[in-house]
């Protein structure tokens, strides 16, 4: 019987040319986390594997970084990024979790702004 | 099996840099993040940054962002962290670790550096 | 950034004893809580994961609990190998920070 919950930051909003995290949690059950899926509508971003580490999608390698934990954090944001956005959890033995968030990227200055990370 | 290999202790003067290296070996190191932890003799743990070696995408806490400069190599497998304008305050055992869905589950021995004149 | 609060900061208990060791957040971190040993002179080692997760290798001894801002680590009769300094830890947001440390020693 599955009996975790997925809490996500939900909805959203971040500013043009700027960064967002997100996250999701997993609770309220003692499964393992053997991986986690970042999906964007039916587009793979990332994937986090206990063994093999951190898959980047080729078309978001320059600006995906992973984190903080087994959250995600989007860079340099455009328009084309507003959408929904899943990370899947696969656990054993419960199975797959699923939660969602929105993403609205804005051009105004309103928009809370995301991480400090840094690309060299 | 995964091991993280650091380099030996340093020796080195108040005001100059040093740069310390932790090997990987075992995983693809490339698709790790790799955080790098400061421990000063008999006291805590403090987080000073990581770097994902894919795509180098480093993220700093704010304490060290002046103080330390992450970098890797994948094609040696190693990260590197470079510290500066080392005093007194700066000495410290430094340890490497991999990050595994979230926790540290793997830390290299440690590199202890001694500032002094 | 989050503070976490180590409590008490030295236990001293025998062998065979059971113990309980806190670490409290100064902000909602969910279960984004990890427990680390470390005794003289070696590297830290994970015991715990996400606040009650078991480690493999870890023995079964070890228990984590907790959620939200209150954490506890579990050692049901302690062995003299358990002696040493325990951490805990958060990966909630940036920057990652520990704890200050729960020194377990022999009575």
């Known amino acids: 019987m599955m009996t975790g919950t997925i809490e996500t930051t939900g909805n959203i909003s971040a500013e043009k040319g700027g960064s967002i995290i997100l996250q999701c949690h997993l609770s309220s059950t003692t499964a393992q986390v053997t991986q986690v899926n970042w999906e964007q509508q039916d587009q793979l971003l990332a994937i986090c594997n206990a063994d093999l580490g951190w898959h980047i999608s080729p078309s978001f390698k320059d600006r995906v970084a992973p984190g903080p934990g087994l959250g995600l954090t989007l860079q340099s944001l455009t328009v084309n990024d507003t959408g929904e956005y899943f990370c899947i959890y696969h656990t054993y033995p419960d199975g797959t979790y699923t939660g969602r968030i929105f993403l609205e990227v804005l051009e105004s200055s309103v928009a809370e702004h995301g991480a400090r990370f840094q690309i060299p | 099996q995964v091991q993280l290999q650091q380099s030996g202790p340093e020796l080195v003067k108040p005001g100059s840099s040093v740069k310390m290296s932790c090997k990987a070996s075992g995983f693809p190191f490339a698709n790790h993040v790799m955080h790098w932890v400061k421990q000063q003799p008999g006291q805590g743990l403090e987080w000073i940054g990581c770097?994902?070696?894919?795509?180098?995408?480093?993220n700093y806490n704010e304490k060290f962002k002046v103080k330390a400069t992450l970098t890797s190599d994948k094609s040696s497998s190693t990260a590197y962290m470079e510290l500066s304008s080392l005093a007194s305050e700066d000495s410290a055992v430094y340890y490497c670790?991999?990050?595994?869905?979230?926790?540290?589950?793997?830390w290299g021995q440690g590199t202890l550096v001694t500032v002094s004149a | 950034d989050i503070v976490l609060t180590q409590s008490p900061a030295t236990l001293s208990v025998t062998p065979g004893d059971s113990v309980s060791l806190s670490c409290r957040a100064s902000?909602?971190?969910?279960?984004?809580l990890h427990w680390y040993q470390q005794k003289s002179h070696e590297s830290p080692r994970l015991l715990i994961k996400y606040a009650s997760q078991s480690i493999s290798g870890i023995p079964s001894r070890f228990s984590g609990s907790g959620s939200g801002t209150d954490f506890t680590l579990s050692i049901n009769s302690v062995e003299t190998e358990d002696f040493g300094m325990y951490f805990c830890q958060h990966i909630n947001n940036w920057p990652f920070t520990f704890g200050s440390g729960t020194k377990l020693e022999i009575k």
């Open positions: 670790a991999r990050e595994q869905l979230g926790s540290f589950a793997y």
């Open positions: 902000q909602n971190i969910r279960s984004n």
């Open positions: 770097i994902f070696p894919f795509n180098e995408i480093t």
